[in-house]
């Protein structure tokens, strides 16, 4: 560093835990959504909801920020005819995505709020409410039954009545579907013309019950029962139905594939192709066979369009195809062999001829990179728009490809926005314009572009307040490096203090996630407790996407099948060894942290020995760790370890109990909320039993009655402080030890 740089750095503040929760660091997402060829709705920082017309460059206020504030509304949604707004308030979270809340309707712009209720109850807390695709049609879900309202002011009618609270879910996910399969609480889908509604009926009656305790607030603790299928236990059953909304509400089930491999199945994707045809992906319980069908909503007959099989497991089963107007042609993502690195995810087009039962299938993209999302299909211009990792696995750039002729590709976002390499995007209905959302590495921003020439028309949001805060702070320096293991090049991200010099000794913190298919090394903007560790406490943080991670081919992804932990440990340890070769790393201060699956890995890795058979890690921490996959969700565990009950060796081998007996003097902090609905406290209880048996050293921090996702920001703040304090203390103890050892050496002399 030159003295001048040094000076300016010393004027800058360090990032603190308070910063993580301050308005200065809060990224504003305008949540812009196209509603026509030229218009989108978005929300300003001050809360006002506006409609912007990109052709006339004018905007109209739809809802005043003050109105949203006065209603204490958390969410808003505008009706398709732009006449009404739907607000939810007093929202109570259930699981990761689901919540209950009160809903009101209000005429735009200044109408009085009117409550949305089922006919039989007033002031009801609903599980869901939302507009349909046309006019003012809306549905809501109450007590797992679906109600339909043709327009505001008309009485709602109950169109699905088979719901049973906590047992039979109509149009909503149960715990497993919300968390592991659909990854949303919404399990209903409108036909594009609004005449039909497809909905999932999920039956949990045979799924075993888990009870979550509540210790506080009453003299005797209470329990909240819910159906949670652990590995090998009875799963929810699901069926897909379509109801007609014009005239008598006729309900028809879509027929699952008649295939012996599909005796037990999941529905992982539903998307309307036309107003009478609905695409459905059916996945067998073992998650190694999937069938994409096109179902006729008038007869319930589903025709197979594509089948996928894997020797390991099928990844990315939620992705929706994109259809031509007539539904005859559709684009979908599938894994295609690309040589030595296995399969990569690419766009395939399937076209059916009017008088033929055979579909013509062609690949639009190819190469050793992944298409991460199909965004839009321009039928007139014969172009498909998508995001991919072609630039680098840690990036997401926006591309277009021709859908006829030579399938030529063009990058639309490359070098388009300064300090931005990780994008998401959405297109206007005519495809003439697009919203480009930059997610990093710089401060996130949203810009509006013309598709023809990519030209930026204007900035919708630049988050200047965050840019200013970042410029005033000692932000970590980010470096990327690859490490080579067994023919793989594994990406590594290193965060160094802003004041870094290679003559200083820094403690090292390895942060692991490693859920199969995930990615830790990405060029996304993030300010987290890890930033605080680097900026305020001079740690070097390292992350590595080892075997089992995503976006680097299925060969690397599937390596971990039936042996979770084994190869991830090797790869993470190689990342640590690589760092320990650097003279600026203090080998006596090395730590590891992970949460959820990362908590499993951090616990698994903590006892690992170094090259000289000494311990590598000084300390480690796990937040809500999975410790035994037979205690975890069926869909997750069975995907990677096979069906529990058939061959349990993989389950036995992956238990962390076998590892923790090797824990020596390392400090180990386990943190677990007691009402964790995803990774039950039972995991930690089992782990601690083993730790005690092995006479290991551990500390346990619980959050009484808190759920997995820590929805309260004061608790989140407490959690981050606890983790930071643990590592700061761990790194400080070593200072003391070094001093003591040095003194002892002097005395001996």
């Amino acid at each position: 560093l030159t003295p001048a740089e040094d000076n300016s750095l010393s004027q800058k503040k360090k990032v603190t835990v308070e910063d993580l929760f301050s308005e200065d660091f809060k990224i504003h997402d305008p949540e812009a959504k196209w509603i026509s060829d030229t218009e989108f709705i978005y929300r300003e920082q001050k809360g006002t909801v506006r409609l912007w017309n990109v052709e006339t460059n004018t905007s109209t206020v739809l809802i005043e920020g003050k109105k949203i504030e006065s209603l204490r509304a958390i969410r808003y949604e505008i009706s398709p005819d732009r006449e009404y707004a739907l607000f939810s308030y007093n929202v109570e979270p259930i699981y990761q995505h689901s919540y209950t809340g009160y809903y009101v309707l209000s005429k735009i712009p200044h109408g009085d709020p009117q409550s949305l209720d089922p006919p039989e109850v007033s002031n009801a807390k609903l599980q869901y409410a939302g507009w349909g695709p046309k006019g003012q049609q809306l549905i809501f879900i109450f007590e797992n039954n679906i109600y339909y309202c043709a327009h505001v002011g008309k009485q709602a009618i109950r169109v699905v009545s088979t719901g049973k609270e906590g047992v039979i879910y109509n149009g909503l996910s149960d715990w497993l579907y919300e968390e592991e399969i659909l990854k949303t609480h919404i399990a209903h889908w409108w036909s594009p013309d609004g005449t039909r509604l497809a909905y999932a009926a999920i039956n949990d009656s045979r799924v075993p019950i888990m009870e979550l305790p509540t210790y506080t607030g009453s003299i005797y603790p209470t329990v909240k029962p819910y159906h949670y299928p652990k590995a090998g236990s009875e799963n929810p059953s699901i069926s897909l139905h379509v109801i007609g909304l014009n005239g008598p509400t006729h309900d028809l089930e879509m027929m699952p594939p008649d295939d012996p491999r599909m005796r037990e199945y999941y529905i992982t994707m539903v998307k309307w192709a036309t107003s009478t045809k609905v695409a459905v992906t059916w996945l067998n319980r073992a998650q190694n066979v999937s069938i994409l069908t096109l179902c006729d909503a008038t007869t319930g007959v589903c025709t197979k369009k594509h089948e996928d099989e894997s020797e390991a497991w099928l990844h990315r089963q939620n992705e929706e195809p994109v259809f031509s107007k007539d539904g005859r042609k559709f684009f979908f993502i599938r894994a295609i062999p690309q040589g030595g690195r296995g399969k990569f995810y690419h766009i395939t087009v399937s076209s059916s001829q009017p008088n033929s039962s055979n579909d013509n299938i062609q690949s639009i993209t190819s190469g050793d990179w992944d298409v991460t999302k199909i965004l839009a299909y321009d039928e007139k211009g014969n172009k498909i728009y998508f995001l991919s990792t072609e630039d680098l696995p840690r990036r997401r750039q926006l591309y277009s490809a021709n859908t006829v002729g030579n399938f030529n590709r063009q990058c639309l976002s490359c070098d388009l926005v300064e300090n931005c390499t990780y994008f998401s995007a959405s297109f206007s209905h005519s495809m003439d314009f697009f919203l480009l959302k930059c997610e990093g590495p710089g401060v996130p921003m949203v810009t509006v572009h013309n598709t023809t020439d990519k030209k930026k028309m204007f900035d919708l949001e630049t988050n200047e307040h965050v840019k200013k805060a970042i410029n005033d702070r000692q932000m970590p320096k980010v470096e990327y490096r690859d490490i080579e293991i067994d023919d793989y090049n594994l990406p590594m991200q290193i965060l160094k203090p802003a004041t870094f010099t290679d003559t200083t000794h820094y403690p090292l913190l390895l942060v692991v996630d490693g859920t199969p298919g995930s990615q830790s090394v990405a060029e996304k903007f993030e300010v987290s407790w890890e930033t605080v560790m680097v900026s305020s406490h001079g740690a070097v943080v390292v992350k590595c996407d080892g075997r089992g991670s995503g976006f680097q081919g299925t060969k690397l992804l599937h390596e971990v099948r039936r042996r979770l932990g084994l190869l991830e440990e090797k790869d993470q340890m190689e990342a640590v060894r690589t760092m320990l070769k650097e003279q600026y790393i203090d080998r006596t201060r090395v730590a590891v942290f992970g949460k959820d699956y990362g908590g499993y890995l951090s616990t698994y890795i903590l006892p690992a020995k170094g090259e000289n058979q000494g311990q590598t890690f000084t300390c480690g921490s796990a937040l809500s760790p999975i410790t035994d996959f037979k205690l975890y969700a069926s869909a997750f565990s069975e995907r990677y370890l096979g069906l529990h009950g058939l061959d349990n060796r993989a389950y036995e081998m992956t238990k962390v109990a076998h590892r923790v007996s090797a824990l020596e003097e390392q400090q180990f902090l386990i943190i677990h909320p007691t009402a964790d609905e995803k990774i039950h406290f039972q995991h930690t209880a089992e782990l601690i039993t083993q730790l005690i048996r092995g006479k290991a050293n551990y500390s346990l921090q619980i959050y009484p009655d808190e759920s997995h996702y820590f929805t309260s920001s004061s608790l989140k703040q407490h959690l981050y402080r606890s983790i930071i304090n643990f590592f700061v203390e761990c790194f400080r103890i070593q200072d003391k030890l070094l001093t003591v050892t040095a003194k002892e050496d002097e005395e001996e002399d």
């Epitope: 028809l252 089930e253 699952p256």
Partner: nanobody, 123 residues
């Protein structure tokens, strides 16, 4: 692909009985709705009786209630229509149909149809 094959039709005097059979092949799907329909030339097809394969629930048109009985033998993958006290107005081509599970047992939205079997009732 589901195939349906009707049999058992024929000629009978008024007041007599017939038993129609419908053999279902090509599918192991258990949640079918099975239906019997009939059609007189020049008239619309009309629903006679229906049954759910999974739970055995049944439906009958008013004109045949108490006289006709729909039943199934899941081991043989066959659905039957027992017709008693036949009347001349029961004369028609009888079709077996299979469809997806639905909240309405009887509607025309059956996906699969047999070729039909003729029933003639003379006075």
């Amino acid at each position: 692909q589901v195939q349906l094959q009707e049999s058992g039709g024929g000629s009978v005097q008024a007041g007599g009985s017939l038993r129609l059979s419908c053999a279902v092949s090509g599918s192991s799907y258990s949640r079918f709705r099975m239906g019997w329909f009939r059609q007189v030339p020049g008239k619309e097809r009309e629903g006679v009786a229906a049954i759910y394969r999974s739970d055995g629930r049944t439906y009958y048109a008013d004109s045949v209630k108490g006289r006709f009985t729909i039943s199934q033998d899941n081991t043989k993958n066959t659905v039957y229509l027992q017709m008693n006290s036949l009347k001349p107005e029961d004369t028609a081509m009888y079709y077996c149909a299979a469809g997806a599970y639905s909240s309405y047992l009887m509607d025309a939205n059956f996906a699969y149809w047999g070729q039909g079997t003729q029933v003639t009732v003379s006075s």
